[in-house]
């Protein structure tokens, strides 16, 4: 069953190469436990940059060595990338699964473009 | 190891009300649902209910609904069914079990059932 | 509600033979993300339910591999390759597809 899911169109990462979005999915049940995955489409291939599951009420928790950290609020997962190097310019598609209850639904965001510049090393001062 | 402890068997009356605890331990206990299921005598297993123990969010069969509250103390690690307005028919064996998403939330552990006997 | 309907009630079984149990449901359990949702459960005599297979022919951790699980659907069975003492219970079906999660009626399974 599909589930609509909204993000931002583009970001801009920080000068320490970090990006946060929003990921927004209209519930159309009761989810009380839910799996957020970000996936990275460049160059027509798609990769899993990171995925949590997390029950409502309680933390949303990344593996140790992710590159992703988050926090949730109702129906928003609040998502931050960070490390992130001007190569990693691309798309982040924010991909959401209510896991339960049944039944299963699936929403998929239309992206968001996340831009990163690498910062201009300092001049050497003489 | 993981543990579901039950409270002990209840004998009520009709119209009484019934309140079940099932204390866990061996794991976190936010971290997954509990469920309860009932098997009246003889019979097979029904499906009543579950709750997210970190918000007290539920999901209830509606043929229990407005009688069956399930409520958790996170403080103690229980899980508590109380059943309200018994009726003879609510005579059966409950049990609380622990959802594992690994299993796509099937029942992995079960407590060893509370026997509720509803009689006048 | 999904109803599901277990095949035989009741079934004798010889140790060392194998034995099958067929459950059915009234609404395909098979998922367009490719999961079937369909458990099975034994509970053996004097004893709490216990999970064998999830997702349908996966084995729950510590499950003898004398079990398996199999079908389509709507249409499945559970398989015991050589049937031993400590098998006898009844087993039972069960669906997450939907809420209320639903179980089959029970297959008893005795020694002859």
């Known amino acids: 069953k599909a589930m609509h899911v909204a993000q931002p169109a583009v970001v801009l990462a920080s000068s320490r190469g970090i990006a946060s979005f929003v990921c927004e999915y209209a519930s159309p049940g009761k989810a009380t436990e839910v799996r957020v995955t970000v996936l990275r489409q460049a160059d027509s291939q798609v990769t899993e940059v990171c995925a949590a599951t997390y029950m409502m009420g309680n933390e949303l928790t990344f593996l140790d060595d992710s590159i992703c950290t988050g926090t949730s609020s109702g129906n928003q997962v609040n998502l931050t990338i960070q490390g992130l190097r001007a190569m990693d310019t691309g798309l982040y598609i924010c991909k959401v699964e209510l896991m339960y209850p049944p039944p299963y639904y699936l929403g998929i965001g239309n992206g968001t473009q996340i831009y990163v510049i690498d910062p201009e090393p300092c001049p050497d001062s003489d | 190891q993981v543990q579901l402890v039950q409270s002990g068997a209840e004998v009520k009356k009709p119209g009484a009300s019934v309140k079940i605890s099932c204390k866990a331990s061996g794991y976190k206990f936010t971290d997954h649902f509990i469920n309860w299921v009932k098997q009246a005598p003889g019979q097979g297993l029904e499906w009543i209910g579950d709750?997210?123990?970190?918000?007290?969010?539920?999901n209830s069969n509606q043929k229990f609904e407005g009688r069956a509250t399930l409520t958790v103390d996170t403080s103690i690690s229980t899980a508590y069914m109380e059943l309200s307005r018994l009726r003879s028919d609510d005579t059966a064996v409950y049990y609380c079990a622990r959802l594992r998403r690994e299993y796509f939330y099937a029942m992995d552990y079960w407590g060893q059932g509370t026997l509720v006997t509803v009689s006048s | 509600d999904i109803v599901m309907t277990q095949s035989p009630l009741s079934l004798p079984v010889t140790p060392g033979e194998p034995a099958s149990i067929s459950c059915r449901s009234s609404?395909?359990?098979?998922?367009?993300?490719?999961?079937?949702?369909l458990y099975w459960y034994l509970q053996k005599p004097g004893q709490s339910p216990q999970l064998l297979i999830y997702?349908?022919?996966n084995l729950a951790s510590g499950v003898p591999d004398r079990f398996s699980g199999s079908g389509s659907g709507t249409d499945f069975t559970l398989k015991i390759s050589r049937v031993e003492a400590e098998d006898v219970g009844v087993y039972y079906c069960a669906q997450n597809l939907e809420l209320p999660l639903t179980f089959g009626g029970g297959t008893k399974v005795e020694i002859k």
């Open positions: 709750i997210n123990p970190n918000n007290g969010g539920t």
């Open positions: 609404k395909s359990l098979l998922h367009s993300n490719g999961i079937t949702y």
């Open positions: 997702q349908m022919s």
